[in-house]
């Protein structure tokens, strides 16, 4: 009888532990990646930003992978994705090639299985950065809720990368899992 | 035998209740604080906004504390932090000393143990607000995922506080816990 | 004796399943709605955007309802709400009626019980879109944490709807439930 009770309890405990494992708040993947200022591309064209910190300052990652400039999903789920991108220019940095700028960010998803890239979110503004002002600044914030599959990759593209603000509080992106896929 | 079963069940229930307590969705801390735009001091390029509503309109708080103008963390965890700051000026409000403005927000974290302040997120824009237009408006939104420890404090600093939009739907900040720290 | 044990286990399982149901990550409502470009209103006045995709591209919905241009809450809770709205104009689209624009978004909550509408979040900017530039672009992002009751409705209002960017990565809004109401 006592053996039977223990077997029953093990069944209950087994499923309970399974639930605990699945619903435990610590199990949820996340990442917050901050720009690596030593490796920002030059120019005014649209480029993919491949150098980010995931293990210093505010940068952190758990149950996701950062590789080749991309944030890789390891766990299927619905994620909230966000990006904050700051651009700035000071007159001491020299003249701008043009006063009319497109300051843009694109958050893209790439699937390895089907080698294609899709823009999940975009944001930005056209700006007139006149020489009458000694300093110019502009920030973009985007965020949204997306279904991501294991192996899919998130990357950030911007225009005018040479104008990026290299501070960790200025230029970053991230993700956190909110729920499983049904 | 029956007593033994109850003891076994109590063990299961005990751990189950412990899980329930830990994973229960209602246990998660959050705050959404809306601006109280009265009596904002001047004297520095950016000023800390110390007066916020947490118990009226959209303002609310649970398992966090609001004190001395700061949002205090009571529970270790990873939190999503956000801020929305709106600036506006109407010609009837009087003049501006300059058309070139820096409209900025800084979300800062202060640790009491190590009395230092760090900027987690910043955003904003330089703006040219000409007197040729009767009304000007600009909003900033920032958000990010951060590890916060009990006792740490979140505060908001802005430039040009006299230009803040005092509506509760315009100028606010908040946080909600997403997951525990491993 | 064996029957008694099963009854005890059923009690444990019953409450456990109840917890599982309540805390299960998949049970949480969400929506990500992308603009339906075929049905964008014209004009420059403030209008409610009623046509959104919830079942194609990035658009998706679960445990919430989309009806009559509104996102309807089916489950009480605290939700994170967000919106990203992009405006653009190219000189090939013809002249603007005015170069001074207010590009705004308002995220509103309507309660059927008390037929009233309240703005939860607003954002935007006044812009000077001069004819000197062939292309203009501007994006707004807002987000915040709000208590929503079953039956309440979320809608999006914008100024200058004819300038909206119709891409699914540009103009969207969404919500996901974070926690229950105590």
């Amino acid at each position: 009888g006592s053996q039977h009770i223990r077997a029953e309890k093990a069944m209950v405990d087994g499923s309970w532990l399974d639930l605990a494992k699945r619903s435990k708040l610590e199990a949820q993947p996340f990442a917050h990646l901050t720009i690596n200022a030593t490796d920002i591309p030059s120019g005014s064209h649209k480029v993919s930003l491949s150098s980010w910190y995931h293990d210093r300052g505010w940068g952190k990652i758990s149950n996701m992978t950062f590789s080749n400039g991309k944030l890789i999903v390891n766990q299927d789920g619905f994620y909230y994705l966000y990006a904050n991108i700051c651009f700035r220019h000071h007159e001491t940095s020299g003249d701008l090639a043009t006063e009319y700028l497109q300051l843009m960010v694109y958050v893209t998803k790439t699937s390895i299985k089907i080698p294609s890239s899709h823009t999940l979110m975009k944001g930005g503004s056209t700006k007139y950065w006149s020489g009458n002002s000694e300093f110019h600044f502009y920030s973009i914030n985007v965020g949204g809720f997306f279904k991501l599959r294991s192996g899919e990759e998130i990357s950030i593209e911007v225009s005018n990368p040479s104008l990026l603000d290299p501070d960790q509080d200025a230029t970053y992106f991230g993700a956190f899992k909110v729920r499983d896929i049904d | 035998g029956s007593q033994h079963i109850r003891a076994e069940k109590a063990m299961v229930d005990g751990s189950w209740l412990d899980l329930a307590k830990r994973s229960k969705l209602e246990a998660q801390p959050f705050a959404h604080l809306t601006i109280n735009a009265t009596d904002i001091p001047s004297g520095s390029h950016k000023v800390s906004l110390s007066s916020w509503y947490h118990d009226r309109g959209w303002g609310k708080i649970s398992n966090m504390t609001f004190s001395n103008g700061k949002l205090i963390v009571n529970q270790d965890g990873f939190y999503y932090l956000y801020a929305n700051i709106c600036f506006r000026h109407h010609e009837t409000s009087g003049d501006l000393a300059t058309e070139y403005l820096q409209l900025m927000v800084y979300v800062t974290k202060t640790s009491i143990k190590i009395p230092s302040s760090h900027t987690l997120m910043k955003g904003g824009s330089t703006k040219y607000w000409s007197g040729n237009s009767e009304f000007h408006f600009y909003s900033i939104n920032v958000g990010g995922f951060f590890k916060l420890r009990s006792g740490e404090e979140i505060s908001i600093e802005v430039s040009n506080p006299s230009l803040l939009d005092p509506d509760q739907d315009a100028t606010y900040f908040g946080a909600f816990k997403v997951r525990d720290i491993d | 004796g064996s029957q008694h044990i099963r009854a005890e286990k059923a009690m444990v399982d019953g409450s456990w399943l109840d917890l599982a149901k309540r805390s299960k990550l998949e049970a949480q409502p969400f929506a990500h709605l992308t603009i339906n470009a075929t049905d964008i209103p014209s004009g420059s006045h403030k209008v409610s955007l009623s046509s959104w995709y919830h079942d194609r591209g990035w658009g998706k919905i679960s445990n919430m309802t989309f009806s009559n241009g509104k996102l309807i809450v089916n489950q009480d809770g605290f939700y994170y709400l967000y919106a990203n709205i992009c405006f653009r104009h190219h000189e090939t689209s013809g002249d603007l009626a005015t170069e001074y624009l207010q590009l705004m978004v308002y995220v509103t909550k309507t309660s059927i019980k008390i037929p009233s509408s309240h703005t939860l979040m607003k954002g935007g900017s006044t812009k000077y879109w001069s004819g000197n530039s062939e292309f203009h672009f501007y994006s707004i992002n807002v987000g915040g944490f709000f208590k929503l009751r079953s039956g309440e409705e979320i809608s999006i209002e914008v100024s200058n709807p004819s300038l909206l960017d119709p891409d699914q990565d540009a103009t969207y809004f969404g919500a996901f439930k974070v926690r229950d109401i105590d």
Partner: antibody
């Protein structure tokens, strides 16, 4: 050296007009708001007019609104005050002052003052 | 308009003494108050900004305090060059206004 030099003050009849000038040097004139402040014979100070750095904002107290006009010429680094329909109560020492602020562009303190120019309105 | 009332109108002191000059606002102006000194036959000179911030080049014996409606300019150990008229000015609300002044004279 940062300097403001006013000129144009004179004795004028009630109802008459006068234009004051202020030459700025030693700083980037186009990046500062400017103002005129007057000191009445009883030594009270009164703000009279302000203009933004780019010249698109101007403001006046009710006492001079509609009669005084502040302008600037950044190419010449010069500030002007055109006064018309002058009254005896406009009699004062007129100072040109640089407007500054730290926190908000709506703020105003005067960190550089000229030596002043005297305006006397006789009835 | 915000009215600034300075007191006393005249203050007679001997060099070496410490003095406090008052400026009271008709409504709260936070810390948007500035102090000026004007010596005889000279133009005003900025001393203190935002109630308590000292200006570069101004002697450290000058200090300011206060917030809301009540403000004080203190001079620690008055020197002969400090005699003149002191004005306060608010920038909290338009139009910008000055106090009537306090004349600091030698006793």
């Amino acid at each position: 050296e940062v300097q403001l030099v006013e000129s144009g003050g004179d004795l004028v009849k009630s109802g008459g007009s006068l234009k004051l000038s202020c030459a700025a040097s030693g700083f980037t004139f186009s990046r500062y708001g400017m103002s005129w402040v007057r000191q009445t014979p009883d030594k009270r100070l009164e703000w009279v007019a302000s203009i933004s750095s780019g010249g698109t904002y101007t403001s006046y107290p009710d006492s001079v609104k509609g009669r005084f006009t502040i302008t600037r010429d950044s190419a010449k680094n010069t500030l002007y005050l055109q006064m018309s329909s002058l009254k005896s109560e406009d009699t004062a020492m007129y100072y040109c002052a640089r407007r500054n602020f730290i926190t908000s562009a709506t703020d105003c303190y005067f960190d550089v003052w000229g030596a002043g120019t005297t305006v006397t309105v006789s009835s | 308009d915000t009215v600034l009332t300075q007191s006393p109108a005249t203050l007679s002191v001997t060099p070496g003494a410490s003095v406090s000059l008052s400026c009271r606002a008709s409504q709260s102006i936070s810390n948007n108050l500035h102090w000026y000194q004007q010596k005889s036959h000279e133009s005003p000179r900025l001393l203190i900004i935002y109630a308590s911030q000292s200006i570069s080049g101004i002697p450290s014996r000058f200090s300011g305090s206060g917030s809301g409606t009540d403000f004080t300019l203190s001079i620690n150990s008055v020197e002969t060059e400090d005699f003149g008229v002191y004005f306060c000015q608010q920038s909290n609300s338009w139009p910008f206004t000055f106090g009537g002044g306090t004349k600091l004279e030698i006793k």
